[in-house]
Interface confidence: medium
Amino acid sequence: GITIPRNPGCPNSEDKNFPRTVMVNLNIHNRNTNTNPKRSSDYYNRSTSPWNLHRNEDPERYPSVIWEAKCRHLGCINADGNVDYHMNSVPIQQEILVLRREPPHCPNSFRLEKILVSVGCTCVTPIVHHVA
Amino acid sequence: GITIPRNPGCPNSEDKNFPRTVMVNLNIHNRNTNTNPKRSSDYYNRSTSPWNLHRNEDPERYPSVIWEAKCRHLGCINADGNVDYHMNSVPIQQEILVLRREPPHCPNSFRLEKILVSVGCTCVTPIVHHVA
């Protein structure tokens, strides 16, 4: 685990006025073990809309490290390996739940938070706006 | 508040042996308001690796309904609108955190759970295995 200097203003778990607060067991159960997923680890290079992965770290958040996808090109890679600007590489975004320490530095007190992350990229036909 | 028929086996929040349990404020904070995402709701139709969304419901989980992406084709859609089987549509998967009531029906006790969801699909060049 990680040791964090405890904020003296950390809420008391027995405080009945603490806003809609529940006990959450952080021994994460992983439901994915049976599915044995083929990790999509190389898709970011093999895709016609390839992406790079950027590390986003925040020690006040759980999980503290999140990898963000950034599309490499505006267009998509064609059969010749060139970028075709008649198509668009776009990020597939996803909202995820994370836990944020609240107040900061409290080891046992969190708030549920929704953040938006880019998971990968896909190649789409552009929307063409015709000017009258 | 909410009234739930309480499971007599619900853990005691004061129990010091309760496994790595923290207090979590469940009033979800939305970090996305600054970015105001343009929801990529039509990418699933416009992508060269289009996908359908399938409903997965579990009332003991939050979020209770998760729509999973399933790629429509093995191949990818080419410029003529036909499926090109020289390329592959593959799902982009992401592990997300969800909350599960544990034990079931306990209003103040949850477990954090990691599940693998398919967020969308991308078009990749296949890996060709040459037989010696």
Partner: antibody, heavy 126, light 107 residues
Framework: EVQLVQSGAEVKKPGESLKISCKAS????????ISWVRQAPGQGLEWMGG????????NYAQKFQGRVTITADESTTTAYMELSGLTSDDTAVYYC???????????????????WGQGTTVTVSS | EIVLTQSPDFQSVTPKEKVTITCRAS??????LHWYQQKPDQSPKLLIK???QSISGVPSRFSGSGSGTDFTLTINGLEAEDAGTYYC?????????FGQGTKVDIK
């Protein structure tokens, strides 16, 4: 399909409290949230607050904070809206509305009203 | 709070005509805008979610577009049963807010 059936019309005096029920049937009560929206005579729609039963969390519009309490009872699949300190300005039709708890195409689709109760007419008069 | 302003307030339309109702938000709300129809003495009914997503069971003549601050609800080929008041609703930030409504009646 989810059906929301609300309690009957009420006539109240200023200063009294009001408690309206919204009974849900069809679908799992825990798989969605309930919001309350009111409509004064000849006026538009006004959101008062909502609850997410699985999380037990409620959110209220600032205007009603301290005066409104939204609760839910999973055993009877019923949501309640209690409003205290009534004045004639609270004369309105009160609606409960279902809010999905969906994670759709990468987003939490938990913020629109896809099914509505029939409405409860509340008259506040001395 | 986010203010939604609809225009027009009132529209009198001939059947089969195209109806356009606009909704302008006081700040960027992405695509978290929804449209409802309310007929006299009835509860509101969801028509469009997230600016442009259609709802199962809603006739295809109803469509939505826009993002950011400017949104449009279009009824392509108005029918007599479409008379009522139409509301836009934003859910980007609390409190949820609604437009003042646009009343559509049939000539």
């Amino acid at each position: 399909e989810v059906q929301l059936v609300q309690s009957g019309a009420e006539v109240k005096k200023p200063g009294e409290s009001l408690k309206i029920s919204c009974k849900a049937s069809g679908g799992s009560f825990r798989s969605y949230g309930i919001s309350w929206v009111r409509q004064a005579p000849g006026q538009g729609l006004e959101w008062m607050g909502g609850i997410t039963p699985i999380l037990g969390t409620a959110n209220y519009a600032q205007k009603f904070q301290g005066r409104v309490t939204i609760t839910a009872d999973e055993s009877t699949t019923t949501a309640y809206m209690e409003l205290s300190g009534l004045t004639s300005d609270d004369t309105a039709v009160y609606y409960c509305a279902r809010v999905p708890n969906d994670f759709w195409n990468g987003y939490f689709a938990t913020d629109y009203f896809d099914d509505w109760g029939q409405g409860t007419t509340v008259t506040v008069s001395s | 709070e986010i203010v939604l302003t609809q225009s027009p307030d009132f529209q009198s339309v001939t059947p089969k005509e195209k109806v356009t109702i606009t909704c302008r938000a006081s700040q960027d709300i992405g695509s978290a805008l929804h449209w409802y129809q309310q007929k006299p003495d009835q509860s509101p009914k969801l028509l469009i979610k997230y600016a442009s997503q259609s709802i199962s069971g809603v006739p295809s003549r109803f469509s939505g577009s826009g993002s950011g601050t400017d949104f449009t609800l279009t009824i392509n080929g108005l029918e007599a049963e479409d008379a009522g008041t139409y509301y836009c609703h934003q859910s980007t930030s609390l409190p949820h807010t609604f437009g003042q409504g646009t009343k559509v009646d049939i000539k």
